[in-house]
């Protein structure tokens, strides 16, 4: 009932709690002398379902049969309407529509840790929409029983608060849960178990790792466990990996040796425990231990390449380059690189430690046979040195790879192809493909890139440090013993017409012809590899088509003669540049009048 119901009553039959699909009869009755003043025929009783009128009657009582009520609670209110006044609330009732409880399913019990308490969970089945009470019963040896009740609206868990002990680990216990509401009751199937079945150990704690003599090959994992634990599972992985290595151990007594860890790698370790080989369940995984394994001396060898540059008649510059070892080869933090330069005949040697760089430049005499050795060092030792004899890499013309081409291959890739050298192709031990950004003037500070290719390959895809709209000087070296041959080509991954034409900076007259000089187009405006320059000229104030001369692009060239101009005629000259994608806009215009004699 709701409100004080001083003026009347609302009765519900057969009950305030009904099964889904049932019909109820609701009666609203006025108490004596509680109707409208004077004229009782004018009493109008109105029945509301929530805030909606559903029935009415003139008189002292209203009878209404209600069907189709939904699951849950529905509120009915009876009001009295008199002429010329607001409706007055008489009384109300809530009707609870639900179902009998289904049989609880999948009853399972667990005790967390040897000192924990027994708790059980189950599946309630579909919601009854009614107040439903659950009773959990546990019976054990010697007619011992425990009982716990749950009055939560959604009850599917109860803790008995009792601790099963390992004195008789094979003793049987039986649990059962019963659900009861106004419409019926139902019990689960009984669940029978022993101490060993339901005790789930606490996860191991206090996990530590020790490396004997700071060596990754002598590593022991330590932890603490509850007293009855028989089995452990260990899992570990490098911190940057998703895949676990798994190890099962029996009677480990809180320690285990790990033999397959990689050096200088951060690992994550976790451990789980179990009391019995085939009974019970595994504990949760322990909290993670994160630890870095010690360094070991580097393995593998550095990939070393070099460049020679002529300085003068007696000296040459050697630039050495090498690539970082991979993490698995470095096996630690590389502290420095050791470079040894030796003159092979005289035996003179110099050694230098390089930190923070992967290149080294020195000047040596042009005479003598020179060799270098480069190795990487960490706190535990050095990699095996990579030895290279310094030679003229392009000296053997017969070893030069043929028909070298460079073609764009998708975004920021260039496919370099070649044919083996004319000289016995089987003599080639390896190819090296080298590339660097093309800078007029051959700037030696430009980073050098290279990759090695097996002798049977005739192509290589270069993608490292390749940018769009940049021209690269690409060389393919064929190496055989202490000889080498090379061929070069220009290539780009993406190109478009240059953004500007060359700037003519001077026009000079010599012997009846002119020499035009220009400034190179800035690299960032070339938009790829230049193929040609064009020089255009026409008589000033003439509307005729200009004449032109096309010059193949060469890196070092920045002047060209023209000998087809007429003397004492003023010409306007300009230049453009072309890539494979098209021609640039005009460069600056210059006027010139040839002073030479007329023929």
């Amino acid at each position: 009932k709701i409100d004080a119901c001083k003026r009347g009553d609302v009765t519900v039959k057969p009950s305030h709690v009904i099964l889904l699909g049932s019909t109820v009869n609701i009666t609203c009755s006025l108490k004596p002398r509680q109707g409208c003043f004077h004229y009782s025929r004018r009493n109008k009783l109105i029945l509301y379902k929530f805030d909606r009128r559903i029935n009415f009657h003139h008189g002292h009582s209203l009878n209404s049969q209600v069907t189709g009520l939904p699951l849950g609670t529905t509120l009915f209110v009876c009001k009295l309407a008199c002429i010329n006044s607001d409706e007055i609330q008489i009384c109300g009732a809530e009707i609870f529509v639900g179902v009998a409880p289904e049989q609880p399913q999948n009853l399972s019990c667990i005790q967390k840790g040897e000192q924990g308490t027994v708790a059980c969970t189950w599946e309630r089945g579909r919601d009854t929409h009614l107040y439903t009470e659950y009773t959990l019963q546990l019976s054990g040896p010697k007619n011992l029983t425990w009982q716990k009740q749950c009055k939560d609206i959604y009850c599917d868990y109860l803790d008995f608060g009792i601790n099963l002990t390992p004195e008789s680990p094979e003793s049987n216990f039986t649990a059962k849960v019963t659900a009861v509401n106004s419409l019926g009751s139902s019990s689960s199937l009984p669940s029978t178990f022993t101490f060993l079945d339901i005790v789930r150990p606490l996860p191991p704690w206090d996990i530590r790792i020790k490396f004997q003599k700071a060596s990754v090959s002598r590593c022991t994992l330590y932890w603490r466990d509850e007293g009855l634990v028989l089995l452990n599972r260990l899992r570990y992985r490098p911190s940057n990996s998703r895949l676990w290595n798994m190890v099962n151990v029996t009677k480990a007594k809180g320690r285990h040796d790990l033999l397959d860890l990689k050096p200088f790698t951060e690992y994550e370790f976790q451990i789980s425990s179990k009391l019995h080989l085939y009974k019970g369940s595994w504990s949760d995984w322990s909290e993670s231990l994160r630890a870095q394994t010690p360094e070991e001396e580097p393995t593998g060898m550095l990939d070393v390449w070099y460049m020679k540059r002529h300085i003068d008649y007696s000296r040459q510059q050697i630039s050495l380059f090498w690539k970082n070892l991979s993490v698995s080869e470095a096996r630690g933090k590389i502290l420095h690189y050791q470079v040894t330069l030796q003159e092979l005949t005289g035996g003179k040697a110099m050694t230098q430690n390089i930190t923070g760089h992967t290149s080294w430049t020195t000047v040596i005499p042009r005479t003598g046979n020179w060799a270098v050795a480069v190795s990487a060092a960490n706190s535990k030792g050095s990699s095996l040195p990579t030895r290279i004899n310094i030679m003229n890499l392009c000296e053997a013309g017969l070893l030069a790879p043929r028909q070298v081409s460079a073609n764009s291959e998708g975004m920021d890739n260039i496919l370099v192809t070649w044919q083996p050298p004319r000289k016995d192709p089987s003599a080639v031990q390896e190819y090296v493909v080298e590339w660097r950004e093309l800078h007029p003037g051959g700037d030696t500070q430009v980073p050098l890139n290279w990759l090695r290719s097996r002798p049977y390959n005739v192509s290589a895809l270069i993608s490292e440090n390749i940018k769009s709209y940049i021209c690269y000087e690409i060389r393919v070296y064929a190496l055989s013993g202490d000889q080498g041959g090379c061929s070069s080509i220009l290539g780009n991954s993406k190109h478009k017409a240059p953004l500007s034409g060359p700037h003519i900076n001077a026009i000079t007259e010599e012997k009846g012809s002119i020499l035009i000089s220009w400034n190179s187009i800035p690299v960032q405006e070339q938009m790829g590899c230049l193929l040609h320059y064009r020089i255009y000229w026409k008589e000033r104030d003439s509307n005729s088509q200009p004449q032109l001369c096309e010059i193949p692009y060469r890196v070092s060239q920045n002047s060209h003669p023209i000998n087809s101009l007429q003397p004492r005629v003023t010409y306007v000259l300009w230049m453009t540049a072309l890539t494979a994608a098209g021609e640039s806009s005009h460069g600056n215009e210059r006027e010139f009048c040839l002073q030479g004699k007329a023929n």
Partner: nanobody, 123 residues
Framework: QVQLQESGGGLVQAGGSLRLSCAAS????????MSWVRQAPGKGLEWVSS????????DYADSVEGRFTISRDDAKNMLFLQMNSLKPEDTARYYC????????????????WGQGTQVTVSS
């Protein structure tokens, strides 16, 4: 699903009579109070009359009191409206509805409505 089908409308002279019928299906008719509602051209819905679920109590709008009579036949799931002394201002489309969708001057357009039947009273 709920279905309400009105019939019996037509053209009638002022002062004449008509009997409207409503056939109900898709719900337990006998347990529901029912109403008649009308809508004149260009106007809103206007409650006309209601009958309770037992058929023992009726209510009428002041404009039709004494001229119209509402009744029901629960055995046939039928609702009726007997209209006498018709006036030109009774011209409208007449709908039957559950009382919970339209009662005592309050109509809920979210409720279920049939197609209605047209009543035209000429002077």
């Amino acid at each position: 699903q709920v279905q309400l089908q009105e019939s019996g409308g037509g053209l009638v002279q002022a002062g004449g009579s008509l009997r409207l019928s409503c056939a109900a299906s898709g719900f337990t008719f006998s347990t529901y109070a029912m109403s008649w509602v009308r809508q004149a051209p260009g106007k809103g819905l206007e409650w006309v009359s209601s009958v309770n679920s037992g058929g023992l109590s009726t209510d009428y709008a002041d404009s039709v009191e004494g001229r119209f009579t509402i009744s029901r036949d629960d055995a046939k799931n039928m609702l009726f409206l007997q209209m006498n002394s018709l006036k030109p201002e009774d011209t409208a489309r007449y709908y039957c509805a559950k009382y919970e969708d339209c009662s005592d001057y309050v109509c809920d357009r979210a409720g279920y409505w049939g197609q209605g039947t047209q009543v035209t009273v000429s002077s």
